[in-house]
Interface confidence: medium
Amino acid sequence: KKVVLGKKGDTVELTCTASQKKSIQFHWKNSNQIKILGNQGSFLTKGPSKLNDRADSRRSLWDQGNFPLIIKNLKIEDSDTYICEVEDQKEEVQLLVFGLTANSDTHLLQGQSLTLTLESPPGSSPSVQCRSPRGKNIQGGKTLSVSQLELQDSGTWTCTVLQNQKKVEFKIDIVVLAFQKASSIVYKKEGEQVEFSFPLAFTVEKLTGSGELWWQAERASSSKSWITFDLKNKEVSVKRVTQDPKLQMGKKLPLHLTLPQALPQYAGSGNLTLALEAKTGKLHQEVNLVVMRATQLQKNLTCEVWGPTSPKLMLSLKLENKEAKVSKREKAVWVLNPEAGMWQCLLSDSGQVLLESNIKVLPTWSTPVQP
């Protein structure tokens, strides 16, 4: 018995071939011997089966001795053995119809779980293998779960249902809702304007929700909410903002925040959360601010950084075009009695300069000591 696999909602064509290459009488019946369709001369006749309005044939092929049964908009319950009677012969075809659906929304937050459910006919024992857009293969039976979705899981999932060494393929488009970056770090000199950007890794027609930026300054004992905002159809409106610092926010996506000036008391880490309408859970992006200050007080030239720096970062003071005078894996370095000239304070990671601040040291004219 020939086995044909079909997909719920699709169209299937079951073949039936006569030895004579001409139009002769044929009938298609189901396993209960109920007539589905057949012919009377060159006319298509239909029987009382439940497939009535969804069953068809190709009359253009009858003259070649081919009498297909076409079933449109397949349902799981269409799974059955179909019998083609032609030339006193019976050809049996077993049709198995499968459906695969994501049993939640196909737009999921990063970190959430995706569950795919297979609808299958009674008596079948299929297996499912799915390949994610990043090339991860997973397998299961009637249900298939993927926990902790990542950004790279966005895209078309290709799932293959295997039964009787035959396969049918499903494509399911999954959108993982997340920020493009989980974390970012901004390096600024004291007094410079700071731009924070929070681009989303997905696009949807309408985007509605609300968000907040909580900030933990390095110098502060607790975190505080710097800004809260609403998002309506991709338009951003500020609800509440602190007076110090007074952040400004762009009115359009991507989410964009401006801090008028970088000051040591603002250096620290922030967490932007975005709650989307009709979604449980929130999107998160961490943002870090490192601020540098170079100062000269009397005979002491000092360079300091504030904020979340990694222990491997190097802070250096050097006279322009000369070797570093001092270089340490610390957050403050200084030089006593610095030579006159343009001094550079550098924050670097494995030789790559992340932040630079210049300060001019003027010559000191000392009066000779009287004898």
């Epitope: 390949r131 990043r134 090339g135 991860k136 293969n137 997973i138 397998q139 078309t156 290709t158 295997l162």
Partner: antibody, heavy 118, light 108 residues
């Protein structure tokens, strides 16, 4: 008879480009995942790329952004477009068919040699 | 990336002896996604085992595969002269679909 025949190999300078082809016969090409695998002289097998029946593509980091796998089901053909070639890409390139209902490369071509040298 | 380690690097045996080849994965691989290949000099590889333990079409029953998780084994029950070759394991669990470095089975 199920068969895969690779072509398009040759000598190319570093930074150059090459397009490999694989002609398939004896089976319904569109029903199968297809792969490219390479092997440098005296070395082991290295997976280069895969294209699924739905057109989904996969690459290792070593070739991502430089190599592009594609297929033309109507022509029963598989392709590998290679740009920005390096000496390390020198190898015999095999085209292979993925299993029908299992994972494994069950039919292989005889390979085509790519040499990247100035 | 899942790294596959094969041991031993070389296995020196005589015809008629039993060969046991190991393939270890750096992280768990579902048995459905592990394959073994044989390659002889100047030839393309040949699929021996898929799904960790199923023999490919036309492969003699002296070849068998076993294992799960991170440890997989290819066994050749009685070596025939034509079995002396290099054997590779490969995982399809997640991209990149890596191969092991190979085990060479040569004549003692």
């Amino acid at each position: 008879e199920v068969q895969l025949v690779e072509s398009g190999g040759g000598l190319v300078q570093p930074g150059g480009s090459l397009r490999l082809s694989c002609a398939a016969s004896g089976f319904t090409f569109s029903n199968y995942d297809m792969h490219w695998v390479r092997q440098a002289t005296g070395k082991g097998l290295e997976w280069v790329s895969t294209i699924g029946t739905a057109g989904d593509t996969y690459y290792p980091g070593s070739v991502k952004g430089r190599f592009t796998i594609s297929r033309k089901n109507a022509k029963n053909s598989l392709y590998l477009q290679m740009i920005s070639l390096r000496a390390g890409d020198t190898a015999v390139y095999y085209c292979a068919r993925g299993g029908d209902y299992y994972y494994g490369m069950d039919v292989w071509g005889q390979g085509t040699t790519v040499t990247v040298s100035s | 990336e899942i790294v596959l380690t094969q041991s031993p690097g070389t296995l020196s045996l005589s015809p008629g002896e039993r060969a046991t080849l190991s393939c270890r994965a750096s992280q768990s691989v579902s048995s459905s996604y592990l394959a073994w290949y044989q390659q002889k000099p100047g030839q393309a590889p040949r699929l021996l085992i898929y799904g960790a333990s199923s023999r490919a079409t036309g492969i003699p029953d002296r070849f068998s595969g076993s294992g799960s998780g991170t440890d997989f084994t290819l066994t050749i029950s009685r070596l025939e002269p034509e079995d002396f070759a290099v054997y590779y394991c490969q995982q399809f669990g997640s991209s990149p679909f890596t191969f092991g470095p190979g085990t060479k089975v040569d004549i003692k």
